[in-house]
């Protein structure tokens, strides 16, 4: 089978949502965990992650081949402490398969704004006053 992991971000006012999306076949879900790490280039694991999510054992309906599961990590107010390098990963506790998404970064500027970089599938958006830039 083919399991795919992507990273994205969305903004709601001062909130920043970091999203890990895993696409998988329903029979591949069991034992899979998706997790988000910060500043962990080598040892990103569920245990060292900011948040983790077990993939659905059941998509809820039977007439689907591939389904998506989303982990969402919400930062209510971005501060300098949130600056760093993030990565979405997934691991099967059953088969040992390990997936690593590309790295993306949050850069907090001296002016009190922030930029999210490395999310290639997102369009460039400009924000001011503690509302950052997604690029």
């Amino acid at each position: 089978g083919c399991i795919n992991i992507t990273s994205s971000a969305s903004q709601e006012g001062t909130r920043l949502n970091l999203i890990c999306t895993v696409w998988h076949k329903k029979e591949e879900a069991e034992g899979f965990v998706v997790f988000l790490c910060k500043d962990r280039s080598g040892d990103c694991s569920p245990e060292t992650s900011l948040k983790q999510l077990r993939l659905k054992r059941d998509p809820g309906i039977d007439g689907v081949g591939e389904i998506s599961s989303q982990l969402m990590f919400t930062i209510s107010q971005v501060t300098p402490l949130h600056s760093g390098t993030y990565q979405c990963c997934a691991r099967s506790q059953k088969s040992g398969i390990r997936l690593q998404g590309h790295f993306f970064s949050i850069l907090f500027t001296e002016t009190g704004n922030y930029t999210v970089t490395g999310l290639k599938q997102r369009q460039h958006l400009e924000f001011s006053h503690n509302e950052g830039t997604l690029s």
Epitope: R54, K56, R57, D58, G60, I61, D62, G63, S69, Q70
Partner: antibody, heavy 121, light 107 residues
């Protein structure tokens, strides 16, 4: 053994909201979709929506989208269905039901006892 | 939305007779169909899963068949406790839907 226990009967006025609870026990709450179904007096079964407590994914039928809110409290293994802007046509028995694991059961294998909602001025 | 149409709306039979209930889907749903029995004042009870698969604790006189768009629930020999309302339900796609029901009543 698996059990779904719902909150008691409610009487509401038109325009009000109601929140029905469904406490689950005897299984891993976060691994199964919880369904919400209603049945008006003398009528058939009408599916409202479902929530997956593992990640809070919720699905609704178009009729209830925006008016029904489904939530799940993992710490107490309790699912909730809130229905707003109530009208007399919402008078019904509301059921929660668990969907069995796909390809194994698939249907709604355990049901709550039902919560009667009466909307009347 | 997949519409499930059950027929007949009412079936009048005597104990010991064979009951044949139909459920037709507005589009193909493979075998993703389930049958329920409901008695007055009670919650529905799952009878048959995935069109034809039996459920533990359900008497063998209940059987299901069909695939695609046409499905049948058969009660081989009606017992007094089988007089109730029967619903079909599809799990093929969102939104999940129920048929309108068939009432099996004593003739």
């Amino acid at each position: 053994q698996v059990q779904l226990v719902q909150s008691g009967a409610e009487v509401k006025k038109p325009g009000a909201s109601v929140k029905v609870s469904c406490k689950a026990s005897g299984y891993t709450f976060t691994d199964y979709w919880m369904q919400w179904i209603r049945q008006a007096p003398g009528q058939g079964l009408e599916w409202i929506g479902a929530i997956y407590p593992g990640d809070d994914d919720a699905q609704f039928t178009q009729k209830f989208r925006g008016r029904a809110t489904l939530t799940a409290d993992k710490s107490t293994s309790t699912a909730y269905m809130e229905l707003s802007s109530l009208r007399s046509e919402d008078t019904a028995v509301y059921y929660c039901a668990r969907r069995g694991i796909a390809a194994v059961v698939g249907g709604f294998d355990y049901w709550g006892q039902g919560t009667t909602l009466t909307v009347s001025s | 939305e997949i519409v499930l149409t059950q027929s007949p709306a009412t079936l009048s039979l005597s104990p010991g007779e064979r009951a044949t209930l139909s459920c037709r889907a507005s589009q193909s749903i493979s075998n993703h169909l389930h049958w329920y029995q409901q008695k007055p004042g009670q919650a529905p009870r799952l009878l048959i899963k995935y069109a034809s698969q039996s459920i533990s604790g359900i008497p063998a006189r209940f059987s299901g068949s069909g695939s695609g768009t046409d499905f049948t629930l058969t009660i081989s020999s009606l017992e007094p406790e089988d007089f109730a309302v029967y619903f079909c339900q599809q799990s093929n796609s969102w939104p999940l839907t129920f048929g309108g029901g068939t009432k099996v009543e004593i003739k």
